[in-house]
C-alpha cells in the first residue's frame, strides 16, 4: 500500500485506494491532472531528449512527466522529461515510468504491495463494471447499509456510480470517494494523456454531460507556461 508515503497522518485502517472512481458506463471518470505528491523536479534532462514545453504531466506522453529541466527547478520553465525507471529517485508518481510508482522517493514496481491491484480495480470500475468484487477496497471501508436503500446524494460516500443518484458519478475526492455532479458546460474537466494515470488521482471529476466534450480552454490571456485548464464544451 501507499501508507509509507502518506506519512504524517494517523490512519486506523488503510485509506481508500488512490483513485478508484466509477464512471459512466463506457466513459472513464475524468480525473484531475497527475501531480500526486508536490515538489518540483531536481534532476537533469537526458541528453538527446527533444524538449516539449508543458504546464502539467497530462500534457506529456505516456513515458514522460512535466518538470523544470534545471537543478533547483524554476517552475516557470517546464518541459516534458523522460520518465524515471525502476530504482531511480522520484518525488511523485508521474515521474516514474508506466508500471512503477513513487514510494519513499524511489520508483518501485507497481506489482509490489498490491498497488497494481488498486489500479486495476480503478480501471475496471471506471468502465462501469459493477460486478467487480472490489475486494481491495471493501476490506478497508465499510459503507453504511443505508447507502443501498437510497441513492447517494452529492458529497456522500460511494463505491461506484450506481450508488449515486441520477446526474451524479462516484469519484475520488482527496480523502474519500463521493458522489459528484456530472459536469456542465464551462466546468473544469480533465483530459487524460498519460495512460492509466486515472488510477493515481486524488481529485477525480465526473465526465462531461451529454453533448459536451472535454477540451482545452481557449483563452488567449493565459501565458503559455501556465497550467492550462480543460473545460466541458459543446461538440
Amino acid at each position: 500500500t501507499l501508507n509509507s508515503v502518506l506519512n504524517s497522518n494517523a490512519i486506523k485502517n488503510l485509506p481508500p485506494p488512490l483513485g478508484g472512481a466509477a464512471g459512466h458506463p463506457g466513459s472513464a471518470v475524468s480525473a484531475a491532472p497527475g501531480i500526486l505528491y508536490p515538489g518540483g523536479n531536481k534532476y537533469q534532462t537526458i541528453d538527446n531528449y527533444q524538449p516539449y514545453p508543458c504546464a502539467e504531466d497530462e500534457e506529456c506522453g505516456t513515458d514522460e512527466y512535466c518538470a523544470s529541466p534545471t537543478r533547483g527547478g524554476d517552475a516557470g520553465v517546464q518541459i516534458c522529461l523522460a520518465c524515471r525507471k525502476r530504482r531511480k529517485r522520484c518525488m511523485r508518481h508521474a515521474m516514474c515510468c508506466p508500471g512503477n510508482y513513487c514510494k519513499n522517493g524511489i520508483c518501485v514496481s507497481s506489482d509490489q504491495n498490491n498497488f497494481r491491484g488498486e489500479i486495476e480495480e480503478t480501471i475496471t470500475e471506471s468502465f462501469g463494471n459493477d460486478h467487480s468484487t472490489l475486494d481491495g477496497y471493501s476490506r478497508r471501508t465499510t459503507l453504511s447499509s443505508k447507502m443501498y436503500h437510497s441513492k447517494g446524494q452529492e458529497g456522500s460516500v460511494c463505491l461506484r456510480s450506481s450508488d449515486c443518484a441520477t446526474g451524479l458519478c462516484c469519484a475520488r475526492h482527496f480523502w474519500s470517494k463521493i458522489c459528484k455532479p456530472v459536469l456542465k458546460e464551462g466546468q473544469v474537466c480533465t483530459k487524460h494523456r498519460r495512460k492509466g494515470s486515472h488510477g493515481l488521482e486524488i481529485f477525480q471529476r465526473c465526465y462531461c454531460g451529454e453533448g459536451l466534450s472535454c477540451r482545452i480552454q481557449k483563452d488567449h490571456h493565459q501565458a503559455s507556461n501556465s497550467s492550462r485548464l480543460h473545460t466541458c464544451q459543446r461538440h
Partner: antibody, heavy 116, light 112 residues
Framework: QVQLVESGGGLVQPGGSLRLSCAAS????????MSWVRQAPGKGLEWVSV????????YYADSVKGRFTISRDNSKNTLYLQMNSLRAEDTAVYYC?????????WGQGTLVTVSS | DIALTQPASVSGSPGQSITISCTGT?????????VSWYQQHPGKAPKLMIY???NRPSGVSNRFSGSKSGNTASLTISGLQAEDEADYYC???????????FGGGTKLTVLG
Amino acid sequence: QVQLVESGGGLVQPGGSLRLSCAASGFTFSSYWMSWVRQAPGKGLEWVSVISSDSSSTYYADSVKGRFTISRDNSKNTLYLQMNSLRAEDTAVYYCARHGIDFDHWGQGTLVTVSS
Amino acid sequence: DIALTQPASVSGSPGQSITISCTGTSSDLGGYNYVSWYQQHPGKAPKLMIYDVNNRPSGVSNRFSGSKSGNTASLTISGLQAEDEADYYCQTYDQIKLSAVFGGGTKLTVLG
C-alpha cells in the same frame, strides 16, 4: 435542511481537557465524512481534523496531532472532538463541518478559551 | 508546507466587479487544479461559494465565479452588492500531509 449544532465549548486552563460535540440533522450522517475547523479570534480559518463516514480513517493538522482525537457515533448522528493538553493557542471558535464536496455545510461554532 | 496567499483586503463600489486572488505554487494549485472559495460574514459560519475551481453550489448567486491560471486561482464577484461585504477564503489540500489548507483570507469592503 442540513443542520449542525456544536456544543461543549467554554473556559479551560492550559493543560486541561474539553470535549466538543456536534449534533447533525437533515441528512444521512453516516454517509458523509465530517471535519472540525477552527478560527482564532480575529484570525483566519484553520482545518483541525477529519473522520471518515465509518470512523475507519482519521486525519489531523500537525498543530493538534497527538493531543486531539476526532470520533463519531453514527447511531446518535453526533461528531466529537476530544481536546487534551490544551494550550493558549488553541483558543478559537470551533466549527463542525460536513465534508461532502469540500466543506459544504457548517455549524455556527462553539468558543473554546484556554486561559489561566 | 503549502501556503495559499491572498490579499488582506479589496474594495469596490456597488455594481462594480472585483477579483480576489489566491496564489499557491506549481506543486499545489498549479499542479492539481483544485481550489474552493468560502464567504464568511462577521460572527457567522463560513459558506461554500465555489468548489473545484469554477463550480457553484446550488443557491449561490451567479454573480460569483471562479477561475484559475497557472498557480493563481481567482474569485470574481460581479455587480457588487452591500451584502457581499465579508471575508473570503480560498482552500485546497496538502497531498503530503493529507490535510486541508485555507488561505489567509481577504476582507472585502463595499464602498458607499
